[in-house]
Every structure is written in structure tokens, then in C-alpha cells.
Interface confidence: low
């Protein structure tokens, strides 16, 4: 489909004559017959195959003819085709006289004609006019002609219809031989598949429309290229999705088991050696002149009572000095110059001379130690508590002081959170890793099913008979009220059958 | 008889103004479609503005849009073309037309013709 247009630019008759030679009363006021036919090598009479179009009278003797195409007028002349144009075409424009109004050739006076031009040749579809002027003895006719093709149609021949579109069934405009141009960020056969953001994964990620980029189940990031772990995954990644694959140091099903204590935590201070030994547990080994769980307290090198036989410790920069009491010597006040006849056990300690008296051994009562039972015997210097325990002296024995969630004699066991019945109203407790959780009875709420709440007693539809059931908030109990012929705390006895009554 | 007498022509310097009139006899000139076409040496002759006779519609050439005006005075039975900012290029001399046809700018009837001639 398309237009063939003839572009009248200028009719030159100076004379004001018809072909036949008579002049024009008082001038030719001068219109056009177009007609377009196939191509025929001698232009011959016979039907315009391809169309005609008239024109008004544009004026009189010589005139030019205003392209009026932008002002709705009719130059230059349409004659539009609804066929593949072959290429080839025959053009014949007359000039015609009207003496009225009435152009109609059947009104004409039969010698109207003022002159008549006729070519044939070829034409391809193009924007380009193809410019011509044609001259006889008496008239010359200037135009210029052109095959345009219609909306929505293209190619050679105009044959090919594309329309450019941007909806759900296309995003394109049409390229000068109709073949399809996408819009920028669409692709494929009709331009309906969007191009997703540059670099969104091919398999787990995909767009509805350009520079997007909206991720399949199991996969997150910008470009739908990272696997979504196990809901609840604390210390664990995934290759794939809903894996938790723990990370060095972590165990469990989320991974968040802290298998590696010593290195996640550094809980051994002043350069002590940490050693892993279970789920959040550890031991420290001190360095010398530290003690303490975590090796956090700094031993004065007299706290280990070096000095025997009551011997006094100096704390020096290098170490310690023991300063002997008469009758001791050595570096630790080890060595003795008394014997037993100087008495020198302390606290009922009995003295047994050794090496023919040169030496002596004191016999303890039971908590008194040393060379000369004179230390109360301190059993807490081993630290016999553990998970962080306070060691008490009590007389001749000992005790530990428990941190919170231990027990035992030496505080070795866990205590269960549980195990003191948290949970009130029947609540079902449940030892969490890092405290406890209840799970509360119906009628109940709050972290220890501390909190009551009311319960729908109508929920389970007690009442029979279509009677009305009303809560009792204060008791969470129901009331029915009874339609008419119905009794009982249920509505469930018809009136006249009474409930039989043990009494 | 029918007769078109164009005036108001002369020099004009560049980015001054001229106002070209057209009197009409013989006929009333607010029934036809009346132009101004015009020649400079040298050249063909050139259509430059039309004003239809049935609604008063107007047309400019390229060259000239949004620096001529035309108008009508049907009392006076005259055509005017204001000429604003003209340049050295519009120098030629300016012809009033008549066209008995149809609105489109024919030139059926000629005036003699008016010189303008831009220039500092």
C-alpha cells in the first residue's frame, strides 16, 4: 500500500488559448485531470488503472501552484494504491478550461481542453522527487512526482506492513525495509524478551522488564548469583541453596555450635595457652606468675607461701626473698639449726629428732602443715573449682561457690535452666542454649505463661439447638441462652421431656 | 477592467521595517486570494506570502516566516505586507498578484511591481 504524488508547480499558457487555438473568455481559468494507469509503452486510452484525481481551478492562463500539503490543500495531488507497486507506471495530466463553476467534463464545452501531456517509465518507491517539465507550442507544465509508501508499510515495493508498537506483544519500531529494530533493553524475534541487568546469572535470575534483575527461589544479590542457607544458618555458607556447610570451628545443623571456643572468643588472657575441650567450654593453662580461670589475676611470687618454718616472704623485682626465723636457713628457710629440745613444732605438732638429733621432722595435726605445722592447711590452692567456682575454706574442709547454671561438688555440672520449673500455668520449659523458653497452655501468654488471657469457652460451639452462647470473661466459662422450648445448662432437653434427676 | 497598484517600496536599512501596500479597482480584492511574489536580478520570480479570499487564511515561504505579515483591509480594499528585520537577501522587486482560481496563490493579474532595497 501506498501513495503515488504529483506536485503541480507552475502552468505557463501566455497567450490564454484552448489546444484547438481559440483564446479563453476572458482568460482559461485553468484545472487538472490526473490520470495513473499501468505502464504502457504507447500511452493509449482506456481505463486509469491505478487512479485519477481532479483539482479545482488553481487559476488563470500562467500561474504558480502553491504546495499546500501543510495547509490541508490538496498539492500535492494524492493518488493512493492498495497493491505492491510494480515499479512501472503511465502518467497523463490535462489541463482543462471552465467557463462556470462545473467541472464536470460533461458539463465542458467539448474543445475545454487546453493542453495534454502524457509519459510512462520507471519509478522506484523512494522520498526523493523525480523533478519534469513538459512543453508544448502553446503551454508548458512544470511538476515533479514521487511513489511514497503508507503508513505502517515499507520495502521496495510497499508490500511489507510492519507497526511499530511497545506493549505486552512487542517493543520495536520498523527499519526502512521493514524488518523489526527492538527498543533499546529488548530482544528476540519480536522484541518481547527483556534484557535483564547486565550480568544476571542466566539460570537463577530473570526479568519481566529491561535492567532488571528478580531472583528464582533459593538465590539472592544484585545479579541472583548467591545461594540463600538454611533459614536459621548462623555460622555456615552454602554452595547451593538451603545448605549450612559450617564454617572452620562451628558444628550442629546451623552451625552455631561454637566448637572452637579458644580461637572465636580468646577468653585466656596474659599469654595463657587455651585448649578446647567441648561446646563453649575451655581450659586455660597459665603462664607462671598467673592464676585465675581465664589467667586474669597476677600471682605475687609470695603467694605461694615459698618460705618454710615460718619464714617471712619479700616480693623483689627478680623474684622473692625468705627472711628465716632463728634457728632456719637455706633459700626456702629449709634447713634447721634447732632440735626437738627447742620445741619447734607449732600447733600440737609432735617433733621426732632425725640423724642422730642433727635434724628434726614435726608430725601435723590434721589442717596444720609445714616443716613446723605452722601453716593452716588452704585447700583451695589447687582450684579445685571449675566453670569459674569460688573456693571456700571451711575448717578441715572445703567448699565451691557456683557461678550461676552450675552445680556439683566442684561446680562441673550444667544446671538446667529448666530445672527449677520456670514456667507457670503448666507451661512445657525448654533449655535454650542461652536461657530457656516456655510454651504456654491455651488461656496463657508472657515469657513465663505469667500473663492470662481469656479463652473463647463459645469456640467449641457447646450450646445445642441453635441457642446463643455467651462468654463469661471472669471465669472463661460459657452461658447458653435457650431458644424457646429448649432447657438445661446446654439447651440440650426439649421442655416437657425433663432431665431425669438422680435425687 | 481589473487593476493592481503595489507602493511603499525603497530603502530600508537591515533590521528596520517597510510597509508594501497593494490597491486594488476593477473588482473587490476581499473575494479573491491575493500574494506577493517577488523577483530579485538574476532570479526566477519568487512566491512569498498569500491571503485567501473566503477565511482570511495566510501563508509564508520559509524564508520570510516570522518576519513579514500579511493583511487585509476589505474597507480600503488593499493588501499590506509589513516587512520586519528584512536582510540583505530580501532586495528584489515585490508584485502584487491576484488570483481568480481558488485560494491557492495563483497569479492570474499582476501590479507593476515596487522596488525594495535593504541596505546600510
Known amino acids: 500500500s501506498g501513495v503515488f504524488q504529483l506536485q503541480l508547480q507552475e502552468f505557463i499558457n501566455e497567450r490564454g488559448v484552448l489546444a484547438s487555438g481559440r483564446p479563453c473568455e476572458p482568460g482559461c481559468r485553468t484545472f487538472f485531470r490526473v490520470c495513473l494507469k499501468h505502464f504502457q509503452a504507447v500511452v493509449s486510452p482506456g481505463p486509469c488503472t491505478f487512479g485519477t484525481v481532479s483539482t479545482p481551478v488553481l487559476g488563470t492562463n500562467s500561474f504558480a501552484v502553491r504546495d499546500d500539503s501543510s495547509g490541508g490543500g490538496r498539492n500535492p495531488l494524492q493518488l493512493p494504491f492498495n497493491f505492491t507497486w510494480p515499479g512501472t507506471f503511465s502518467l497523463i495530466i490535462e489541463a482543462w478550461h471552465a467557463p462556470g463553476d462545473d467541472l464536470r467534463p460533461e458539463a465542458l464545452p467539448p474543445d475545454a481542453l487546453i493542453s495534454k501531456i502524457a509519459i510512462q517509465g520507471s519509478l522506484a518507491v523512494g522520498q526523493n522527487w523525480l523533478l519534469d517539465e513538459q512543453t508544448s507550442t502553446l503551454t508548458r507544465l512544470r511538476y515533479s512526482y514521487r511513489v511514497i509508501c503508507s503508513d505502517n508499510y515499507y520495502g521496495d515495493n510497499c508490500s511489507r506492513l510492519c507497526k511499530k508498537r511497545n506493549d505486552h506483544f512487542g517493543h520495536y519500531v520498523c527499519q526502512p525495509d521493514g524488518n523489526l529494530s527492538c527498543l533499546p533493553g529488548w530482544t528476540g524475534e519480536y522484541c518481547q524478551q527483556p534484557i535483564c541487568l547486565s550480568g544476571c546469572h542466566e539460570q537463577n535470575g530473570y526479568c519481566s522488564k529491561p535492567a532488571e534483575c528478580l531472583c528464582r527461589p533459593g538465590w539472592q544479590g544484585r545479579l541472583c548469583n548467591e545461594c540463600i542457607p538454611h533459614n536459621g544458618c548462623r555460622h555456615g555458607t552454602c554452595s547451593t541453596p538451603w545448605q549450612c556447610t559450617c564454617d572452620e570451628g562451628w558444628g550442629g545443623l546451623f552451625c552455631d555450635q561454637d566448637l572452637n571456643y579458644c580461637t572465636h572468643h580468646s577468653p585466656c588472657k596474659n599469654g595463657a595457652t587455651c585448649s578446647n575441650s567441648g561446646q563453649r567450654s575451655y581450659t586455660c593453662t597459665c603462664r607462671p606468675g598467673y592464676t585465675g580461670v581465664d589467667c586474669e589475676l597476677e600471682l605475687s611470687e609470695c603467694d605461694s607461701n615459698p618460705c618454710r618454718n615460718g619464714g617471712s616472704c619479700k616480693d623483689q623485682e627478680d623474684g622473692y626473698h625468705c627472711l628465716c626465723p632463728p634457728g632456719y636457713y637455706g633459700l626456702h628457710c629449709e634447713h634447721s639449726t634447732l632440735s626437738c629440745a627447742d620445741s619447734p613444732c607449732f600447733n600440737g605438732g609432735s617433733c621426732r629428732e632425725r640423724n642422730q638429733g642433727a635434724n628434726y621432722a614435726c608430725e601435723c595435726p590434721p589442717n596444720f602443715t609445714g616443716s613446723n605445722c605452722e601453716k593452716k592447711v588452704d585447700r583451695c590452692t589447687s582450684n579445685p573449682c571449675a566453670n569459674g567456682g569460688q573456693c571456700l575454706n571451711r575448717g578441715p574442709s572445703r567448699m565451691c561457690r557456683c557461678r550461676p547454671g552450675f552445680t556439683g561438688t566442684y561446680c562441673e555440672l550444667h544446671v538446667s535452666d529448666c530445672a527449677r520449673n520456670p514456667c507457670a500455668h503448666g507451661g512445657t520449659c525448654h533449655d535454650l542454649e542461652n536461657g530457656l523458653m516456655c510454651t504456654c497452655p491455651a488461656g496463657f501468654s508472657g515469657r513465663r505463661c505469667e500473663v492470662r488471657t481469656s479463652i473463647d469457652a463459645c469456640a467449641s460451639s457447646p450450646c445445642f439447638n441453635r441457642a446463643t452462647c455467651y462468654t463469661d470473661l471472669s471465669t472463661d466459662t460459657f452461658v447458653c441462652n435457650c431458644p424457646y422450648g429448649f432447657v438445661g445448662s446446654r439447651c440440650e432437653f426439649p421442655v416437657g421431656l425433663p432431665p431425669s434427676f438422680p435425687w | 477592467e481589473v487593476q493592481l497598484v503595489e507602493s511603499g517600496g525603497g530603502l530600508v536599512q537591515p533590521g528596520g521595517s517597510l510597509r508594501l501596500s497593494c490597491a486594488a479597482s476593477?473588482?473587490?480584492?476581499?473575494?479573491?486570494?491575493t500574494g506577493w511574489f517577488r523577483q530579485a536580478p538574476g532570479k526566477e520570480r519568487e512566491w512569498v506570502s498569500c491571503i485567501s479570499g473566503s477565511d482570511g487564511s495566510t501563508w509564508y515561504a520559509d524564508s520570510v516566516k516570522g518576519r513579514f505579515t500579511i493583511s487585509r483591509d476589505n474597507a480600503k480594499n488593499t493588501v499590506y505586507l509589513q516587512m520586519n528585520s528584512p536582510k540583505s537577501e530580501d532586495t528584489a522587486v515585490y508584485y502584487c498578484a491576484l488570483s481568480l482560481g481558488s485560494s491557492w496563490c495563483a497569479y492570474d493579474y499582476w501590479g507593476q511591481g515596487t522596488q525594495v532595497t535593504v541596505s546600510s
Open positions: 476593477g473588482f473587490t480584492l476581499g473575494v479573491y486570494a
